[in-house]
């Protein structure tokens, strides 16, 4: 309706002596700003002077008037949207209706609201859900209808008079739509405070109890159940009675059914409280409890281990591990069922007892081929003495024992000849399968643990033979020993030890790097003609002729070997030198003379030197020395030099004939 | 201290004859020990060895194949000089013409004393 | 008879080590152990540096140093200086009528 004006708040505010009131409040005037306000109690409109009547509580007007009451209430509002009043401390008689009487410019309007004060703190009220389960989570909510800026309240909760561990969120509300402090608790409830007082208790700031609210606790939850038996300890032996029963000690509704359970599986035709075990076997031994049903569902009590206690039955040996190898260790264990448990073993190898072992583990560190065989033992405890079982075999696995490389072949053996050899051994488990042989060759087997070396070679010093099941055993190498002729034979300078000079000492060495037999004989040999016997060729002053090629011979009872032949370089000085001339010794004026310079020398001449008949050296380097044109006067005795890195060496003298041409004599 | 000092003409028409002169000072020219050459160096190709004149018990020459019909060096005993003739120069013969001392070092011989050279161009 | 053969250029900073090689044959230097070696600065007659193995003239530094193997000579200048900036050349003995040949020549600079 839009001739009404507009206003938001609570309808009504609860509060007690001497607390305080906050009215949170919206409005919207007609037409302009408020001009005049003033808070009635309990208003009455009187039609005679078309005003209203009752205590005015504030008042705000043009000329600005307040009464005093003004100090306890207060118009928290403003001209055109808050209208927010406080009254503090709010007393029992300020109860019933407060009318907010408002004037604008030409519209006015009264707006009423409750207000309820009580005499003392009125009780929070406590929400639950409406059902509640053990160990579910539940949010348990405490509220109360009051909240105040200036009055500062606190809520808590208490069970069984304790306060509460959990820890609660306090939320307030001071709003147009709702004004309220709440309080809630998250709170996982146990089967145990089904029936317990829950209290929430409204405090002042200094935790002053002001009033409070108190619920009992309704948990649903299955059956809480405890079990007895006779005897106590639950230890018989076979053909004793045994009783147990079953004694519910809370539930919630009321329990239905009742069972019994062994080892996790119901016993059939047993619903009552108490299960009566008559003649009881070893196959009643186990852990039992009993099941008691409710609409939440089944509750089952602690187990009890009923222990019927016989002697041990036949016994069975377990090997860890076999087959077992040679060296490793194996481990017997002897399994027996008994109750109690076996005290005492007694233990079989091939049916004799093994002294000393009396525990239901054997270990051996370290198994040997005797330790195969049949394991058997026997268990003991209070009730009695077992069965000795069937017994267990254990395989002990090796590598073939003793190998030997055998060689088949008559001695001496000589290369090129054919080899046989054959691999033995003494004892294998599992079966040998296969050989190998040391070094590898492309060698035959004709037959399983036989070797054939065709055309044998000198170096074949040693072979051995592996035997090989899973694993592989060699035998130590056997020594072929096989004869040859000398190998490697070279020619070797012993001295001088740097190049070989014209009238040097030279040793020549014949080596060879093995010969078997060791027995050996030398020869030297140059051009096809033999020099010598020794292992050493010896020249006291070597001269030129000796350079040729030398070969030696060294041979044995099996044969003889040559060496590469070896060149012998003698070096020396320029020798049988000469100067030759060309086109002859007589030449004619002008025309040109060659002078060679001829020689024999190793190394060959490297520098060459010229000089006339006074001994003049002329600046020619070459072997050649030509001169061109040729003149009269160079007629005469020339001679060269040569030299190397030995030496020199000088020619004699050659004579140079140079005559007049025909011109000149004919000019004379 | 040696010294070689060369004269002659800077410039010498195509066909007739090139000559230069060089005067020894220090040394003679017939000094059993050295011999008197004559290299020539032109941009195309480089350094040239001509000739060479030198006494021993005698008066030799040694000319280079290449102008060995056209190339005569004398020596001058009476004025201690050395000289060099080309005959029927071509343009080809332009070069810097030098003289030079040939000694020798240990074995073999070089060139240790050079003259200040002479620069010939032929053209008509 | 053919010239010996150079590189054209070498180049060094101060202080660094050059080496010019001067390639012939088995007719001349691999036939003596003779290699002469020239130094040239423009406008100047050659100067003899070096000779056969390491006969140097009065007054060369021993900076210069030459090697030679089998139809190669080396010419190496240690401790180069701005003055060694000049065309070096080579020079052999032959066994032909050309009784001694030169190098092309190698133009050194000193950076």
């Known amino acids: 309706d839009s001739s009404k004006w507009v206003f938001e708040h609570p309808e009504t505010l609860y509060a007690w002596e001497g607390a305080c009131v906050w009215i949170p409040c919206t409005y919207r005037a007609l037409d302009g700003d408020l001009e005049s306000f003033i808070l009635f109690h309990n208003p009455e409109y009187n039609k005679n002077t078309s005003k209203f009547d009752g205590t005015r509580l504030y008042e705000s007007t043009k000329d600005g008037k307040v009464p005093s009451e003004q100090k306890r209430v207060q118009f928290l509002g403003d001209k055109n949207k808050n209208c927010t009043l406080s009254i503090h401390p709010v007393h029992l008689n300020d109860s019933g209706q407060l009318g907010l009487r408002m004037e604008s410019k030409t519209e006015k309007w009264m707006e009423r609201i409750h207000l309820n004060v009580s005499e003392r703190p009125f009780p929070p009220h406590i929400q639950l859900p409406p059902e509640i389960q053990e160990s579910q989570e539940v949010t348990l909510t405490c509220l109360l209808n009051f909240s105040c800026y200036g009055y500062p309240i606190q809520l808590q909760w208490l069970l069984e008079g304790v306060p509460m561990r959990q820890a609660a969120v306090t939320s307030t509300s001071l709003t147009i739509k709702s004004v309220f402090t709440r309080s809630e608790l998250k709170f996982s409830p146990q089967w145990s405070h089904h029936g317990k007082i829950v209290t929430c208790q409204l405090q002042d700031a200094d935790g002053k109890f002001l009033s409070n609210d108190t619920v009992q606790l309704n948990v649903k939850h299955t059956p809480k159940l405890e079990i007895k038996v006779t005897p106590s300890d639950a230890i018989v032996r076979e053909g004793d009675s045994v009783t147990m029963t079953c004694e519910v000690s809370s539930s919630n509704p009321e329990y239905t059914t009742v069972s019994w359970l062994k080892d996790g599986t119901s016993l059939k035709k047993q619903n009552t409280f108490t299960l009566n075990l008559r003649e009881v076997t070893k196959d009643q031994s186990g852990k039992y409890c009993c099941q008691v049903s409710n609409d939440v569902g089944p509750g089952r009590s602690e187990e009890v281990f009923l222990q019927v206690q016989y002697a041990p039955e036949p016994s069975t040996v377990q090997i860890l591990h076999s087959p077992a190898v040679e060296g490793s260790q194996v481990e017997f264990l002897c399994m027996s069922l008994a109750n109690p448990l076996p005290t005492n073993y007694t233990w079989y190898h091939n049916g004799k007892e093994m002294q000393g072992r009396t525990e239901e583990k054997v270990h051996i560190p370290k198994i040997l081929p005797w330790h195969a065989g049949t394991y058997s033992c026997v268990a003991e405890n209070i009730l009695g003495t077992g069965q000795r079982g069937p017994g267990a075999e254990l395989d002990v696995q090796y590598p073939p024992k003793k190998v030997t490389t055998v060689i088949q072949n008559p001695m001496p053996i000589r290369e090129g000849d054919t080899v046989t050899l054959s691999c033995n051994y003494n004892s294998s488990n599992p079966s040998v399968t296969r050989y190998e042989w040391k070094p590898h060759g492309a060698w035959e087997e004709p037959s399983l643990g036989v070797l054939k070396i065709q055309n044998v070679g000198w170096d074949n010093t040693t072979i051995a033979c592996a035997a090989c099941n899973s694993w592989c055993s060699w035998a130590s190498p056997v020594a072929l020993n096989v004869q040859y002729a000398p190998r490697d034979v070279r020619v070797r300078k012993i001295k001088p030890l740097s190049e070989i000079h014209s009238g040097n000492s030279v040793s020549l060495q014949c080596d060879f790097s093995s010969s078997h037999p060791k027995e050996v004989q030398f020869f030297w040999e140059k051009n096809g003609r033999l020099l010598g016997k020794e292992s050493q060729l010896n020249f006291d002053s070597i001269s030129p002729e000796d350079a040729g090629s030398y070969s030696c011979w060294v041979n044995n009872s099996i044969g003889q070997t040559a060496s590469k032949a070896w060149t012998l370089e003698v070096l020396y000085a320029p020798r049988r030198l000469r100067v030759s001339m060309s086109p002859g010794d007589q030449v004619m004026e002008g025309k040109s003379a060659t002078l060679t310079c001829e020689s024999d020398a190793n190394p060959p001449v490297s520098h060459y030197t010229w000089f006339d008949w006074n001994n003049q050296s002329l600046p020619y380097h070459s072997q050649k020395l030509r001169l061109e044109p040729v003149k009269v006067q160079h007629s005469g005795a020339y001679w060269c030099q040569g030299t190397n890195s030995v030496g020199k060496g000088r020619s004699p003298l050659s004579t140079l004939t140079v005559y007049y041409s025909p011109e000149t004599i004919g000019r004379r | 201290e040696v010294q070689l000092q060369q004269s002659g003409p800077g410039l010498v028409k195509p066909s007739q004859t090139l000559s230069l002169t060089c005067a020894i000072s220090?040394?003679?020219?017939?000094?059993?020990?050295?011999?008197w050459n004559w290299i020539r160096q032109s941009p195309s190709r480089g350094l040239e060895w001509l000739g060479r004149t030198y006494h021993r018990s005698t008066w030799y020459n040694d000319y280079v194949g290449s102008v060995k019909s056209r190339i005569t060096i004398n020596p001058d005993t009476s004025k201690n000089q050395f000289s060099l003739q080309l005959n029927s120069v071509t343009p080809e013969d332009t070069a810097v013409y030098y003289c030079?001392?040939?000694?020798?070092?240990?074995?073999?011989?070089?060139?240790?004393?050079w003259g200040q050279g002479t620069t010939v161009t032929v053209s008509s | 008879q053919s010239a010996l053969t150079q590189p054209a250029s070498v180049s060094g900073s101060p202080g660094q080590s050059i080496t010019i090689s001067c390639t012939g044959s088995r007719n001349d230097i691999g036939a003596y152990e003779s290699v002469s070696w020239y130094q040239q600065h423009p406008g100047n007659a050659p100067k003899l540096i070096i000779h056969?193995?390491?006969n140097r003239p009065s007054g060369v530094f021993d900076r210069f140093s030459v090697s030679q193997s089998g139809n190669t000579a080396s010419l190496t200048i240690s401790g180069l200086q701005a003055e060694d900036e000049a065309d070096y050349y080579c020079s052999s003995h032959t066994t032909t009528s050309t009784l001694y040949v030169f190098g092309t020549g190698t133009k050194v600079t000193v950076l």
């Open positions: 056969g193995v390491n």
């Open positions: 030079a001392r040939e000694t020798d070092y240990g074995d073999y011989g070089a060139f240790d004393i």
């Open positions: 220090g040394d003679s020219v017939s000094n059993n020990n050295a011999a």
